[in-house]
Amino acid sequence: DSEEDEEHTIITDTELPPLKLMHSFCAFKADDGPCKAIMKRFFFNIFTRQCEEFIYGGCEGNQNRFESLEECKKMCTRDNANRIIKTTLQQEKPDFCFLEEDPGICRGYITRYFYNNQTKQCERFKYGGCLGNMNNFETLEECKNICEDGPNGFQVDNYGTQLNAVNNSLTPQSTKVPSLFEFHGPSWCLTPADRGLCRANENRFYYNSVIGKCRPFKYSGCGGNENNFTSKQECLRACKKGFIQRISKGGLIKTKRKRKKQRVKIAYEEIFVKNM
């Protein structure tokens, strides 16, 4: 089917945020199963970070399959910005501050911080590099700013303002937006190339975060980590700028991206995860 559709995409001058999902099945590849029915279903695409349509065969498959776009969005996406702004202005912590620390299903372990609701403090844990949840911060300071109570009953919100616990008045502080909104690529893009454990010599690409470029490497065929792409284009899309077009003045623009409708089984680059 060569029918094409045009898709409007919001483009920002910043990189994509880390991928943090509530459910690990949202990372599964779309699976039409072995049967031959033609059923319209929806799945969450970890590369575009959107719920998209696919054709389901009617049997087997996996949990990344939803009857409606709304159900898919409900299970696999979060309106993070709105949720944070809303809860902060109500002088509450964002709800994700109360989630248990979640290392995710990958194994490129890196230091992150989470808010421990029992101790009421931000603490260190080891994050596997993909999925997990939003109670996951790159710095102790960012975690404290978003989830910890400030001194004297003040709660610091995410736009550099303090909420006065007594009369709810807003006191301007720093105008710096915290790094939750300083979008950057998926955290697995920071992991080193990992050949894996097998003996094949497959041509793959990984994102070198030091030089900011995608570079080739030889993949053994199994294991490794998610910083592993079958093409340079896919590597750049996931780790460099995605569908991002740099614009000198920053801000938002709309661009058009043409994409063929897919009527066959979706085949992504392999994503290497720990066995569930």
């Epitope: 372990y109 911080y113 029992q118």
Partner: antibody, heavy 118, light 112 residues
């Protein structure tokens, strides 16, 4: 005073199973990630597994992944290690340890000896 | 995995004299957050391990100040300014920067 008391060790044949327990007291158990570390006779220490505060998520050493399962019951202030398909090389004293806010082990139990032998 | 190498493996010392144990890691222990998660444990004969020092140089509560930790990157040192009888045992360095956590082979401190 923080106290961690392990139990459940003993002699088991290769391929057998054993379940270790660690009873915690003197601190709010549910506030801390917990770990198991082992020490083979006359040898050094080896990290085995860690579990998050609420018990939903786990980490394992490659040497035990797929064979050992760490779990916890916060209501009972208890940590567990279910060990299946045991091998001679799993023979060791097993310690439970608490993880502090830096994700570092700060308090250790007295250990329980697991011997895998035919 | 990060390999931790301690020297010496055996350290006979005279009571009241200083002692020094070296610990080297196969890669830097400086984490992305700017902290270095290098720690020292003491295991007295027949006892379980006890944490002495964390984050290179911070002493745990109740640890005598004759113990000091220092170092950065890949090279670290534990010093005992004046060895006492109760200091006899095995000392382990271990790193909590990279996963999995790994330990040194241990240094046995004994009285001459």
């Amino acid at each position: 005073e923080v106290q961690l008391v392990e139990s459940g060790g003993g002699l088991v044949k290769p391929g057998g199973s054993l379940r270790l327990s660690c009873a915690a007291s003197g601190f709010t158990f549910s506030s801390y990630a917990m770990s198991w570390v082992r020490q083979a006779p006359g040898k050094g220490l080896e990290w085995v597994s860690t579990i998050t505060t609420g018990g939903s998520y786990t980490y394992y050493a490659d040497s035990v992944e797929g064979r050992f399962t760490i779990s916890r019951d916060n209501a009972k202030n208890s940590l567990y290690l279910q060990m299946n398909s045991l091998r001679a090389e799993d023979t060791a004293v097993y310690y439970c340890a608490r993880q502090d806010g830096n994700f570092l082990m700060d308090y250790w139990g007295q250990g329980t000896l697991v011997t895998v032998s035919s | 995995d990060v390999v931790m190498t301690q020297t010496p493996l055996s350290l006979p010392v005279t009571l009241g004299q200083p002692a020094s144990i070296s610990c080297k890691s196969s890669q830097s222990l400086l984490d992305l957050d700017g902290k270095t998660y290098l720690n020292w444990l003491q295991q007295r004969p027949g006892q379980s391990p006890k944490r002495l020092i964390y984050l290179v140089s911070k002493l745990d509560s109740g640890v005598p100040d004759r113990f000091t930790g220092s170092g950065s990157g890949t090279d670290f040192t534990l010093k005992i300014s004046r060895v006492e009888a109760e200091d006899v045992g095995v000392y382990y360095c271990w790193q909590g920067t990279h996963f999995p956590f790994t330990f040194g082979q241990g240094t046995k401190v004994e009285i001459k």
